[in-house]
């Protein structure tokens, strides 16, 4: 059909922190390259419909959807989304195309559906569908990497069963601890799933995708190391492939590797050997022991011994699900202002867990650090000295965990006051928790030394604001005080703090703030 | 059969050193570690620390650090502790002892005797 | 550093009766899945000789008699029956943290 005009549907993803999405604006700025949606005309429909590829947005994800017509002279338009009208402002670009565009801020689920895009223009009236979907993050997925040995090689594939797919790499490192760290310049990436290097010092695996990163370490046994008196641990679930490697370095070739399970040697297919040269002639062996799946009776001591090097032991542990182990009472810290203090945490878990540091409602990113007993520990230290509660929480595939922590801040009393017809109140924070005194001044005591001790009523840690606890105290109003000045004052270990009332007929109040 | 032979008695004077030995035999001397362990009568027995003869890696108790030293001989299959600066503290027998990582101290020397006296 | 107390410090046990030793950490010698006590026999004029390692394994040669029990800072070591044979110190010992440490011992005496 000659009078159809051309027509491009585009959709322009933007980055979550993009300055340029704004309500206001009724075509952003492009943050990222657009998309195109195909736009075909739907055939067998009555009218003139062009449908747009389907849309699938993440949760909070900001975009724009957009119609650029090359048509001549003016359009206008309409936006239809779930049987209400929606404002169109058309524009021209530099091309002198028609563009109509649709932002969804922050997409939620009940933004996503049908948008159908009503336009009329001097030689035609045609209709645009998008139909917009949120992302099933929850049928997505990021598991551990696992460890296969490759068939006739000597060879190790990674294996993450992840969706969507993710990407696979090798970490590779050949020096000992901190070096280690992942951007040290000692660590080399491969990113393939097979590796046949299998002599390096440290080898880890790490799948991700748009859930994350995970990662799986090469257990290791070193014989070239002293052993530790204290035995290392593997945990891992029934069903899970084990892999243990053993390496050792030695003058020259004449020494052999076995492995062990509780004084038994392991059974042929549950081991493989390679060997090398290293560049300056000395004979590295490595004896693999691996489980291809994991059974209770395969818990127990595992020994790597070698012919000239000191025997290593690991004990593997095979659990039937998951576990976070931690004491759950809660805990509480009194600090001053400017005393360093961290909020930790020490516990065992398997799989490793993922955590967060959460006050006040914002969540925190949480590090932890293994200590070489088998446990971990993470710690907080950016509570920036306020009060109130802290919550840790963790999670693996199989366990959570909760843990709760109260701060409070040593420091001497702020008081607020206000007052009404009938009473004066006074507010303070300040740990720990204030007493009250309330004076009156009068001639007879300019110095407001005279204690009123009628009508007060006082009230402790009524109400907590972000868990930081507030005391206050009230004083009911009789004929005896009105029209004086009363000086009500907070007092801890730490200090004293006071607020002159003036209390006289209704009106306004004044405070003076006395400390 | 795996034994451990330790040197002889020692008598000695305070402040000077002595250095004893201790022949492994009825196994491979780098495979395991070797520890050497004090213990006077009436107060038990004292950990003095380990040398690894493969690497010779040691590792001491605080408490004896500058008192003794650990060496080895991977030749003569012999582990060796020198003690310095002796006193009456000294004086006790000093047993060496095989560790086995999966199982503690599985074989001991019968021990030196070391006698500190003027 | 971990201290370890012995009780009794001597005990008399008829022959054929049952031998009970106990050893208390002053603070878990457990790490990761083991605890990392472990028991010594040692007889006049003899060097020791380990009988228990990682609290409950029988060293090969030691008769069945000998048996380790306990975690993280309670241990005993059992002699179920006592033989003339078994009268000895009997010392416990923890390699969880350095420096390692013996607890001072037990006599045990057959009656």
């Known amino acids: 059909n000659q009078d159809l005009p051309v027509i491009k549907c585009v959709l322009i993803n933007h980055k979550n922190n993009d300055s340029s999405v704004g309500k206001s604006s009724s075509y952003p700025m492009v943050s990222e390259s657009p998309e195109d949606l195909g736009c075909a005309l739907r055939p067998q429909s009555s009218g003139t419909v062009y449908e747009a590829a389907a849309v699938e947005v993440d949760v909070s994800a900001s975009i724009t959807l957009q119609v650029l017509v090359d048509a001549p002279g003016n359009i206008s338009c309409l936006w239809v989304f779930k049987h209400s009208s929606l404002n169109c402002q058309p524009h021209f670009d530099l091309q002198n195309r028609g563009v109509v565009s649709m932002v969804i801020l922050k997409m939620t689920e009940t933004q996503a559906g049908e948008y159908l895009l009503f336009i009329q223009s001097e030689a035609t009236n045609y209709t645009i569908l998008f139909t917009v979907s949120i992302r099933n993050t929850l049928l997505y997925t990021l598991r551990r990497p696992y460890f296969r040995k490759m068939e006739n090689q000597d060879a190790l594939v990674c294996i993450s069963e992840s969706v969507p797919e993710p990407i696979v790499e090798w970490v590779l490192c050949d020096s000992q601890g901190e070096s280690c760290k992942e951007e040290s310049p000692a660590v080399v990436k491969k990113e393939e799933k097979v590796l046949h290097e299998l002599f390096g010092t440290d080898i880890r695996c790490c799948a991700r995708n748009e859930l994350g990163r995970e990662c799986t370490r090469l257990f290791t046994i070193d014989l070239n190391q002293t052993p530790q008196t204290t035995l290392p641990q593997l945990f891992l679930k029934v069903g899970e492939p084990l892999w243990i490697r053993c390496k050792a370095v030695h003058v020259n070739h004449g020494f052999g590797l076995t492995w062990e399970l509780e004084n038994k040697a392991l059974e042929e297919g549950n081991y493989f050997e390679m060997s090398t040269y290293s560049t300056n002639r000395t004979m590295i062996r490595i004896l693999f022991a691996f489980v291809s799946s994991v059974a209770r009776n395969d818990t127990g001591y595992y020994t790597c011994s070698s012919s000239k090097h000191p025997s290593q032991s690991a004990l593997v542990t095979i659990v039937e699900k998951g576990f976070i182990n931690a004491t759950n009472s809660s805990e509480d810290y009194e600090i001053d202002q400017y005393e360093e203090f961290c909020f930790s945490v020490r516990f065992k878990a398997y799989p490793q867990i993922r955590c967060t540091w959460t006050f006040s409602r914002k969540s925190f990113p949480c590090e932890q650090k293994g200590l070489d007993n088998g446990y971990s520990i993470s710690k907080f230290c950016n509570h920036k000295h306020q009060p109130g509660e802290y919550i840790f929480h963790a999670e693996n595939d199989d366990a959570q965990f909760t843990k709760m922590f109260t701060l409070n801040i040593r420091r001497k009393p702020q008081v607020l006051a206000e007052a009404s017809a009938s009473q004066a109140s006074c507010f303070s924070d300040g740990y720990p928790l204030p007493s009250w005194t309330w004076k009156k001044c009068s001639d007879k005591s300019p110095n407001c030394t005279e204690e009123i001790t009628e009508g007060v009523w006082n009230r402790k840690a009524n109400r907590k604001v972000f868990g930081q606890w507030v005391s206050s105290s009230t004083l009911n109003m009789s004929e005896a005080i009105k029209g004086f000045l009363v000086k009500c004052c907070a007092y801890n270990s730490l200090g004293t703090s006071c607020e002159t009332i003036l209390l006289n007929s209704p009106g306004p109040f004044p405070f003076i703030q006395d400390n | 059969e795996v034994q451990l032979q330790e040197s002889g008695p020692e008598l000695v004077k305070p402040g000077a050193s002595v250095k004893m030995s201790c022949k492994a035999s009825?196994?491979?001397?780098?495979?395991?570690?070797m520890h050497w362990v004090k213990q006077r009568p009436g107060q038990g027995l004292e950990w003095i620390g380990f040398?690894?003869?493969?690497?010779?890696?040691?590792k001491y108790n605080e408490k004896f650090k500058g008192k003794a030293t650990l060496t080895s001989d991977k030749s003569s299959s012999t582990a060796y502790m020198e003690l310095s600066s002796l006193t009456s503290e000294d004086s006790a027998v000093y047993h060496c002892?095989?560790?086995?990582?999966?199982?503690?101290?599985?074989?001991w020397g019968q021990g030196t005797t070391l006698t500190v006296s003027s | 550093n971990i201290v370890l107390t012995q009780s009794p410090a001597s005990l008399a046990v008829s022959l054929g009766q049952r031998a009970t030793i106990s050893c208390r950490a002053s603070?878990?010698?457990?790490?990761?899945?083991?605890?990392?006590v472990h028991w010594y026999q040692q007889k006049p004029g003899q060097p020791p000789k380990l009988l228990i390692y990682?609290?409950?394994n029988l060293e090969s040669g030691v008769p069945a008699r000998f048996s380790g029990s306990g975690s993280r800072s309670d241990f005993t070591l059992t002699i179920d029956p006592v033989e003339a044979d078994d009268a000895a110190t009997y010392y416990c010992q923890q390699n969880n943290e350095e420096p390692w440490t013996f607890g001072g011992g037990t006599k045990l005496e057959i009656k």
């Open positions: 009825g196994y491979t001397f780098t495979r395991y570690v």
């Open positions: 603070e878990s010698v457990d790490t990761y899945g083991s605890s990392f």
């Open positions: 002892a095989r560790w086995r990582q999966l199982g503690s101290l599985d074989s």
């Open positions: 040398i690894n003869p493969y690497n010779d890696d040691t």
């Open positions: 990682l609290a409950s």
